[in-house]
Interface confidence: medium
């Protein structure tokens, strides 16, 4: 299995980063960590999503990964899809610095990330709180401001 | 079982530096935000900066920019908050605290047990 | 810098009654707001994260509301232990800030 993997993260407009991920043990966690700059200051939802496509940018990579067909929820709810790993908080200068560690996603087996896409948000994810059908799939967490492919890494 | 545990309690001369240390056991210290907290006698609480320890990056009120320094060492798992050109309004307890969940709950669920300093002549 | 004002700033009250203190924002942080408990010569502890969700441990009693600007920590059902001074705080954006406090005394 791999331990290790890495997406660098791509947008048409100024948003840019690059995260890291480590999980040491197969069924134990996931360090994620990294910068994104060019967001506006506040918070961004941060997700992944279904496919590895970005043939047609951003929106191709699909839904929130979600095998177990649950509803969209915050990383710490049980209620959540696999993909949902939250928000990430930019500073005034637009640098959002990413630090995470989430016991659901994972880099083997049915929860694994690799091959899918890794998205950054217009607007902050509402955990699915926001009272309304979109909260419960999305966070109404907008359009996607970048995004990229997570793969395998040395 | 989390536990952020501080140094002792400091007295200070004006225009000196303390620097308070926060040494953390259970969950991966690395990935873990870690944030001070000041609270002056009496008055209310104040967020002074945070430390992401994997990145080293930091984040810091606009209030204390250019005196606080944060730093990390993964190696101890320990966490510290330098204030420099000290003036008696900085006499307090200074906290460190971190969220259950590194999952940028950004709120503080661990808190140290405080570390008084007192600023004198 | 994202202004946090609560009231009351103080507050007397008896076991079981019911208590709700507000906390307003100088602008709109969506739900990213949370509560503290903080006893004298302790450590604040945490109650509520995201206004609502109630912290793992902490008892039903407590819960949060609000979103936007405008928020609520209500105490259904006071007890003796609960007696403290309570804070909420916006995690929106930085700096991340503090309301003054409201003290909750046994009247």
């Known amino acids: 299995m791999a331990t290790k993997a890495v997406c660098v993260l791509k947008g048409d407009g100024p948003v840019q980063g690059i995260i890291n991920f480590e999980q040491k043990e197969s069924n134990g966690p996931v360090k994620v960590w990294g910068s994104i700059k060019g967001l506006t200051e506040g918070l961004h939802g941060f997700h992944v999503h279904e496919f590895g496509d970005n043939t047609a940018g951003c929106t191709s990579a699909g839904p929130h990964f979600n095998p177990l067909s649950r509803k969209h929820g915050g990383p710490k709810d049980e209620e959540r899809h696999v993909g949902d790993l939250g928000n990430v908080t930019a500073d005034k200068d637009g640098v959002a610095d990413v630090s995470i560690e989430d016991s659901v996603i994972s880099l083997s087996g049915d929860h694994c990330i690799i091959g899918r896409t890794l998205v950054v948000h217009e607007k902050a994810d509402d955990l699915g709180k926001g009272g309304n059908e979109e909260s419960t799939k999305t966070g109404n967490a907008g359009s996607r401001l970048a995004c990229g492919v997570i793969g395998i890494a040395q | 079982q989390v536990q952020l545990v501080q140094s002792g309690a400091e007295v200070k001369k004006p225009g000196s530096s303390v620097k308070v240390s926060c040494k953390a056991s259970?969950?991966?210290?690395?990935?873990?935000?870690i944030s001070w907290v000041r609270q002056a006698p009496g008055q209310g609480l104040e967020w002074m900066g945070r430390?992401?320890?994997?990145?080293?990056?930091?984040n810091y009120a606009q209030k204390f920019q250019g005196r606080v320094t944060i730093t990390a060492d993964k190696s101890t798992s320990t966490a510290y908050m330098e204030l420099s050109s000290l003036r008696s309004e900085d006499t307090a307890v200074y906290y460190c605290?971190?969220?259950?969940?590194?999952?940028?709950?950004?709120?503080?669920?661990?808190w140290g047990q405080g570390t008084l300093v007192t600023v004198s002549s | 810098d994202i202004q946090m004002t609560q009231s009351p700033s103080s507050l007397s009250a008896s076991v079981g009654d019911r208590v709700t203190i507000t906390c307003r924002a100088s602008?709109?942080?969506?739900?990213?707001l949370a509560w503290y408990q903080q006893k004298p010569e302790k450590a604040p502890k945490s109650l509520i994260y995201?206004?609502?969700s109630l912290q793992s441990g902490v008892p039903s009693r407590f819960s949060g509301s609000g979103s936007g600007t405008d928020f609520t920590l209500t105490i259904s059902s006071l007890q003796p232990e609960d007696f403290a001074t309570y804070y909420c705080?916006?995690?929106?954006?930085?700096?991340?800030?503090f309301g003054q406090g409201t003290k909750l005394e046994i009247k």
């Open positions: 602008q709109g942080i969506s739900s990213w």
């Open positions: 995201g206004a609502s």
């Open positions: 705080q916006q995690y929106n954006s930085y700096p991340y800030t």
């Open positions: 430390i992401i320890p994997i990145l080293g990056t930091t």
């Open positions: 605290a971190r969220p259950d969940s590194p999952n940028h709950s950004n709120t503080f669920d661990y």
């Open positions: 259970g969950g991966s210290f690395s990935i873990y935000v």
